[in-house]
Amino acid sequence: VNAIPDQCSPLPCNEDGYMSCKDGKASFTCTCKPGWQGEKCEFDINECKDPSNINGGCSQICDNTPGSYHCSCKSGFVMLSNKKDCKDVDECSLKPNMCGTAVCKNIPGDFECECPEGYRYNLKSKSCEDVDECSENMCAQLCVNYPGGYTCYCDGKKGFKLAQDQKSCEAVSVCLPLNLDTKYELLYLAEQFAGVVLYLKFRLPEISRFSAEFDFRTYDSQGVILYAESIDHSAWLLIALRGGKIEVQLKNEHTSKITTGGDIINNGLWNMVSVEELEHSISIKIAKEAVMDINKPGPLFKPENGLLETKVYFAGFPRKVESELIKPINPRLDGCIRSWNLMKQGASGIKEIIQEKQNKHCLVTVEKGSYYPGSGIAEFHIDYNNGSNAEGWHINVTLNIRPSMGTGVMLALVSSNNTVPFAVSLVDSTSEKSQDIVISVENTVIYRIQALSLCSNQRSHLEFRVNRNNLELLTPLKIETISQEELQTQLAILDKAMKGKVATYLGGLPDVPFSATPVNAFYNGCMEVNINGVELDLDEAISKHNDIRAHSCPSVWKKTKNSEDQVDPRLIDGK
């Protein structure tokens, strides 16, 4: 009988996977190393796919190898000593200056260098750098970048305001339409803040005498209606208004006289006025009733070469005349004349001149008050320092307003360095058809009076007092204010400005940067201002935009019967 050869020789088992080979009767048994399986230990066990030990017990990556396996970690993780678990590497703790001046934030497997909003991390400099949002065209009109942010502005002077998205601009809309109808037959006397509205020259036969007839309407109490003089300036006649009454000043080779008389006619009604040179006197009539008779020894204007040459100026006089007046007068007069007849020549020629020039036309209907059309400002120089007051400077303001647009600067103090240490403005409220009143120091809103129905037929009354320690609102309104601590900081800024030179502006702002104030639009509407007990007369302003009407306010377009005409009862002027 032949002996059965050793079945383990030659080796039938997989050399890499077997541990031992056992010879049997015509058979063999391979005993496998851990990690191997199969009759000849030829198959690697994939421990990573073992359902009884998910992922080989590895917390992240399981790498199968012939006869074995090992765990590994993703980038940014480190293996724990049990060779199974991966722990996040806290790079921020590992290298504390990893982000330089930025804040290091650890995230699983990585880290981030965090910067405050409005800043971007610069890898090179390891620092947070301001994002220039303005270079990214974030704003529709003007953009001002500052460290950590930006602010959009709109050109209020062109009638725009910032939309609710704080980026785009929208037109400041009319909230109370006004009757701005004019008639060329009505000559507006306040077309120029400084200067004559109309200048006429008459060459008439020597038998002619001076005469002027016209209808006159005003709420203004003082100003020049007309001034007439001889060609050589040797004789002159001034017809003016003072204290609401007609005043006549005259001077020639024979006499020099001033007379005031008659009833007060600055009542907003049309009054018929006539001034006629008679043989021995000058007769002044109102509504055809004589109110003054001024004696004169000879003719008012001396004829020369058989001709009476006279120059007539409406609403003003030549500059050199100012020093010659018997009694000085502020010539500015906000009023209208119609149906004029000068030197008995009728209105011929004049109407044609006026017809062409829209700004010489007067409003058909007006009310008492001052009108800001949203195109300019008036400047005053007011001394706010009160020697008797221990607080130093103080500002007591009363505003009577009837806005026709819901956004605009009503009152502002401007420093010589072009900052706006104090402003009172109107802004359209977020709630529909109402307005907020904002009081600001530079570009910080310190008070906000919210959601008032100001665009109404009735005037609204607002009163407040400011000194270096406090801002007090005397009108009983719900206000939203900054913290007391922040208010004191802002009042300190105002105090510093008040110790220097400040100019007072009504109706808007001069040329200051857009970013100087929260609001930069011109105010549009009617407004009377009283500062420290003095009613401001726009005729007394240092300068005033020609379109601002000092003593006349357009009427509301049409009286509606809906609730929009209701004004907050707390704001109604009780005067």
Epitope: L80, S81, K87, D88, V89, D90, S93, P108
Partner: antibody
């Protein structure tokens, strides 16, 4: 398998000195950060000192309570970490553990050696 | 130095009962680690990076939290879970531990 074995504990008088040793095996010692943590009934677990790897310039850090008195050191060739303790105080009494530290946690702890500071 | 306050200091739970212990931090930290220590033994890393269980730790354990408030929860208490649990954080070159919560079985 990771092994950490502390030695050198015992009784010492206040003001005295003592050196603790920790023998490590089962991991690449030269790449490891090693720390000493102590435990006492009064203070609970309290971190004492850390020595980082050669890659981190063997930087050392100490708890405020031991700064200037204790010194941590290592010998990568012997896979050993040491804690030299001087000016010992009674409040230094406790079990001192040698730990293998991975990414700011105490991954593996030795069995500890007890130090008693008493007169 | 950041202080860790564990509460409660001692608590007991019946088998099967849910257990929650907290670790309050004096100022915000990114991660919290937890250790288990049984009498006569060294502490053992139990939960790392706030919520990751170390291999071999039963799934009934979980960790959560962020900022200044962290917790370790045991969904169903078992006798082998009786031990003292410590929280630990690292910040500004300093390691700090909580005072521990001793969990006993009723």
């Amino acid at each position: 398998e990771v092994k950490l074995e502390e030695s050198g504990g015992g009784l010492v008088q206040p003001g005295g000195s003592m050196k603790l040793s920790c023998a490590a095996s089962g991991f690449t010692f030269s790449d490891a950060w090693m720390d000493w943590v102590r435990q006492s009934p009064e203070k609970g677990l309290e971190w004492v000192a850390e020595i980082r790897s050669k890659a981190n310039n063997h930087a050392t850090y100490y708890a405020e309570s031991v700064k200037g008195r204790f010194t941590i050191s290592r010998d990568d060739s012997k896979s050993g970490v040491y804690l030299q303790m001087n000016s010992l105080r009674p409040e230094d009494t406790g079990i001192y553990y040698c730990t293998l530290t991975t990414a700011f946690l105490f991954d593996y702890w030795g069995q500890g050696t007890t130090l008693t500071v008493s007169s | 130095q950041i202080a860790l306050t564990q509460s409660p200091a001692i608590m007991s739970a019946s088998p099967g009962e849910k257990v929650t212990m907290t670790c309050s931090v004096s100022s915000s930290v990114s991660y919290m680690h937890w250790y288990q220590q049984k009498p006569g033994s060294s502490p053992r890393l139990w939960i790392y990076d706030t919520s990751n269980l170390v291999s071999g730790v039963p799934g009934r354990f979980s960790g959560s939290g962020s900022g200044t408030s962290y917790s370790l929860t045991l969904s169903s208490m078992e006798a082998e879970d009786a031990a003292t649990y410590y929280c630990q954080q690292y910040s500004g070159y300093l390691y700090t531990f909580g005072g521990g919560t001793k969990l006993e079985i009723k």
